[in-house]
């Protein structure tokens, strides 16, 4: 913490301006009134403060607003945002997308994924749901940030908003997030024709259950290998060789390269070798011909 001293009369601060860059840390602490700083936050970002000086200004604001900054201050944080921790941001209540845009711009090029994720979370909480305007802002100013939200937060996305989500916005989404988004996407695109539906639903398929994947295999979609590799292991394992062949179409030729990778590896282990041989790729590791498969999980469930 900055030690407290009294402010020399000639150093008294009546407005936030460039003269402050010549103040030492102790002088800033003693001479800048926190309320004045808060009222003139819009000037701070135009002044080339050092990181040490920004620490002092942050300390001032923290003392003035121990429960969290008001949005009028947050909106004008500028480079002071780089000094904020996720714990600081968790105290905020943010509803304005202009505030979100301003801070996303500042954070670009800095290692601030935890802070940005927390900020987005606060915006969703502040606005009550992940509405179309918020999604549009995220996709425009922070591609991939949608996936920083928890499954719980993503559950507030109305299906009508899903159309605004682009494939690249889902690149970093994990299985739990796609589990939440997939049913919404399915609902959002349900009235589309086969090929158009597949193009739209494809980025969300990491959350699809087996029955939906099986249904796709009957629709001549020719799923690419990259999409297939992102399907849930549990969704892929029950598929037959014939279903995978129909699902992938010409892309089935790519299974050879993915032979050792999940979910292909796990799927191969569950297929009869005879059936795998029909793919003409030399895939190995299937159940040898003549072997009987006992599903012990069924016996355990009965006993």
């Amino acid at each position: 913490d900055v030690e407290r001293t009294t402010c020399p009369p000639e150093k008294e601060v009546h407005e936030i301006d460039e003269s402050l860059i010549f103040y030492k840390k102790r002088e800033l602490e003693a001479c800048v009134d926190a309320a004045l700083l808060a009222a003139q936050m819009d000037r701070v970002d135009a002044i080339p403060f050092t990181y040490e000086q920004l620490d002092v200004l942050k300390h001032k604001l923290d003392e003035l607003y121990p429960q969290g900054y008001p949005e009028s201050v947050i909106r004008h944080l500028g480079h002071l945002f780089l000094k904020m921790s996720p714990e600081d941001i968790r105290k905020w209540n943010v509803t304005s997308l202009e505030t979100l845009k301003a801070l996303l711009k500042v954070s670009k090029g800095h290692e601030m994924s935890a802070q940005v994720a927390t900020l987005i979370d606060r915006v969703v909480v502040g606005r009550g749901q992940l509405d179309k305007d918020t999604v549009d802002t995220l996709t425009a100013f922070c591609p991939g940030c949608l996936c920083s939200l928890s499954p719980e937060r993503l559950s507030s996305v109305p299906p009508s908003v899903i159309g605004a989500v682009r494939p690249q916005d889902l690149d970093t989404c994990g299985p739990r997030q796609l589990d939440v988004l997939y049913p919404k996407a399915r609902l959002a695109f349900q009235n589309m024709s086969g090929s158009e539906y597949f193009v739209k639903i494809r980025p969300f398929l990491g959350g699809a259950p087996t029955e939906d994947v099986k249904a796709l295999s009957q629709q001549n979609v020719s799923m690419d290998l990259a999409t297939f590799m992102k399907l849930r292991r549990e969704a892929v394992l029950p598929l037959t060789v014939a279903e995978v062949q129909k699902l992938l179409g010409p892309h089935v030729e790519g299974l050879k390269v993915e032979e050792q990778h999940s979910p292909v590896r796990d799927w191969i282990l569950k297929q009869r070798q005879d059936d795998l041989d029909t793919l003409g790729l030399g895939l190995q590791g299937g159940i040898p011909n003549g072997y009987l498969i006992l599903d012990l999980s069924v016996r355990e469930a009965l006993s």
Epitope: D224, L225, Q245, P250, H251, E253, G254, K256, V257, D277, T278, L279, G280, L281, G282
Partner: antibody
């Protein structure tokens, strides 16, 4: 040693069909799909399609879909490519090519010697 | 389908010159590009796969680079036996496509 040996040159009239063969040896025939590529005189290479040698399932380039038929005879490790309704612009060298599945969908590491098909009235 | 635009369509260079051929894909193909050499009356011969991996027995004067949509094939010091037509092939999609070819001649 992997070898792809193709049938000999053919001269056909417009409207006729031609069937080119490609006999494979030196590897497990049913472990690699076979592709067909053609090259018109002085032109570049054009992928025509491929066939799964195990179940005979083909996939064709949209450009040839209505006229091409690819088949397989597992007993002789031979694949066939038949092109119908021939026209003069089908005059080309037709190659069979085997992919190596090193990455993605595989690049062609072995080629047949080529079969020249001439379409002329 | 993925289009492969190869340039130049032909070039003339002196023995010992550095020769560069480019291929541009119509969409991202990662590094899934191969380069072939074809001499008159012969089948294409694989030189490079996965953008820069040299096939065994191929002279080290041949090299490749790039990723995404822009790729380059280079002959560091042109030799008389390099007179041929060179093609790129994308295999990021099962429906393979070739570039239009570059005919390399000696000045």
């Amino acid at each position: 040693e992997v070898q792809l040996v193709q049938s000999g040159a053919e001269v056909k009239k417009p409207g006729a069909s031609v069937k080119v063969s490609c006999k494979a040896s030196g590897y497990t025939f049913t472990n690699y799909w076979m592709h067909w590529v053609r090259q018109a005189p002085g032109q570049g290479l054009e992928w025509m399609g491929n066939i799964n040698p195990s179940n005979g399932g083909p996939y064709y380039n949209e450009r040839f879909r209505s006229r091409v038929t690819m088949t397989v005879d597992k007993s002789t490790s031979t694949v066939y490519m038949e092109l119908s309704s021939l026209r003069s612009e089908d005059t080309a060298v037709y190659y069979c090519a085997r992919p190596y599945y090193g990455s993605s969908y595989g690049y062609f590491d072995y080629w047949g010697q080529g079969t020249t098909v001439t379409v002329s009235s | 389908d993925i289009q492969m635009t190869q340039s130049p369509s032909s070039l003339s260079a002196s023995v010992g010159d550095r020769v560069t051929i480019t291929c541009k894909a119509s969409q991202d193909i990662n590094k899934y590009i191969a380069w072939y050499q074809q001499k008159p009356g012969k089948a294409p011969k694989l030189l490079i796969h996965y953008t820069s991996e040299l096939q065994p027995g191929v002279p080290s004067r041949f090299s490749g680079s790039g990723s995404g949509t822009d790729f380059t094939f280079t002959i560091s010091s042109l030799q008389p036996e390099d007179i041929a037509t060179y093609y790129c092939l994308q295999y990021a999609n099962p429906l393979r496509t070739f570039g239009g070819g570059t005919k390399v001649e000696i000045k």
